[in-house]
């Protein structure tokens, strides 16, 4: 074979999203018959020649950034995406509210606003059983992007997370849930309670307001200040994407 | 922290094999990352294998991997080092080092995270 070997994928189960003291197994995965596997987290030093890790309690020391690679014969795959395991419940809850209520009517406008008592300068909002809420922004996103109307798929449990950039996986713990009801329509949401929560965006400010725009399930961002969309790594690629969007400087 | 004694070191031939045995004491012996480094003369200590707390998952360097093995007994509270295929080239002192870190975490590589460290045993491989 010319050239490297396809990467394998790496998954945490079950959710990437581990709160403090909770199990949560990596598993690297890769074509039948591999030589070797080789799991790392990335800018540690640390390693193991497993396809799988399991971590019976979740600490803050084992959040970070991992990938896995694996070896047959002399050839080594090309890396597999980097997964983000993230320790939730490091801090304090923060309090997820509607504007101008959480029952708004279809075709009507919605602000999803996050509020944290530190000094957070992230945050993200996760619709449950969503399992892929995100698709590559096509564009970037400035506070005068409109704000697109609300249609049935959108009623709903939200919660958020905030955390800070300078330790970008150790989060809060979520938020207490919020039901967004939209009202005036007989469609019934498409709903998956056994999924994992799934990320629906990331946010910047303090104290953000995040406009939630539906469109093609892509959730976008307003608030009093210019935001700059910058997609970083996404996910684990057998997980839900996940894309960051971080204020611009 | 662990108390470490190595034991098994001496003068083995080209092609030959040693087991090498670290005996500790110490109450953090089971939640402790187990490591094997080593020391040729005039050259930094270098990781050699590393035992993840339950002994499920192992890290080698390319150096040894398929020729060295590693593994612990936890009842015994021991770590081995089993060398087959040795060559002049492995001639150092062997060290036993143990690392605290939480359950979970992946065999570090790096000196720094190993807190415990036996006084080491000396192998020699020559004709």
């Known amino acids: 074979q010319s050239g490297p070997l396809p990467k394998p994928s790496l998954q945490a189960l079950p959710s990437s999203l581990v709160p403090l003291e909770k199990p949560v197994t990596l598993r690297c995965q890769g074509p039948p018959g591999v030589d070797l596997y080789r799991l790392e987290k990335l800018s540690s030093s640390r390693y193991q020649d497993q396809a799988v890790l399991f971590i019976p309690a979740m600490k803050r020391s084992l959040a970070g950034r991992y990938r896995c690679s694996y070896q047959n014969g002399s050839l080594w795959s090309l890396p597999s995406d980097q997964l983000e395991l993230v320790a939730t419940g490091v801090f304090a809850k923060p309090s997820l509210s509607a504007q101008p209520g959480p029952a708004v009517s279809s075709g009507g406008d919605v602000t999803l606003q996050c509020q944290t008592r530190y000094g957070f300068d992230q945050f993200a909002l996760y619709k449950e059983g969503d399992p892929a809420p995100y698709k590559n922004p096509e564009r970037w996103y400035r506070a005068s992007f409109p704000i697109i109307t609300v249609t049935a798929a959108h009623s709903g449990t939200y919660r958020c997370y905030s955390f800070s950039s300078r330790d970008p996986y150790l989060w809060s713990a979520p938020s207490d849930p919020l039901e967004l009801v939209v009202t005036g329509t007989s469609v019934t949401p498409s709903r998956l309670p056994t999924e994992p929560p799934s990320p629906v965006a990331e946010f910047s400010e303090a104290t953000a307001e995040l406009t939630v725009s539906f469109t093609n399930e892509v959730f976008t961002t307003e608030t009093s200040r210019s935001i700059t969309a910058s997609p970083k790594e996404s996910d684990s690629p057998a997980g839900p994407a996940r894309q960051y969007y971080t204020k611009g400087n | 922290q662990v108390q470490l004694q190595e034991s098994g070191g001496g003068l083995v031939q080209p092609g030959g094999s040693l087991r090498l045995s670290c005996a500790a004491s110490?109450?953090?012996?089971?939640?402790?990352?187990m490591g094997w480094f080593h020391q040729a003369p005039g050259k930094e200590r270098e990781f050699l294998a590393g035992?993840?707390?339950?002994?499920?998952?192992?890290y080698y360097a390319d150096s040894v991997r398929g020729r060295f093995t590693i593994s612990r007994d936890n009842a015994k509270n021991t770590v081995s080092l089993q060398m087959n295929s040795l060559n002049p080239e492995d001639t150092a002192v062997y060290y036993c080092?143990?690392?605290?870190?939480?359950?979970?975490?992946?065999?570090?590589?790096?000196?720094?995270?190993?807190?415990?460290w036996g006084r080491g045993t000396q192998v020699t491989v020559s004709s």
């Open positions: 080092a143990a690392d605290p870190s939480h359950p979970g975490s992946l065999i570090s590589t790096r000196r720094s995270d190993y807190d415990s």
């Open positions: 110490g109450r953090t012996f089971t939640r402790s990352i």
């Open positions: 035992i993840s707390w339950s002994g499920a998952n192992t």
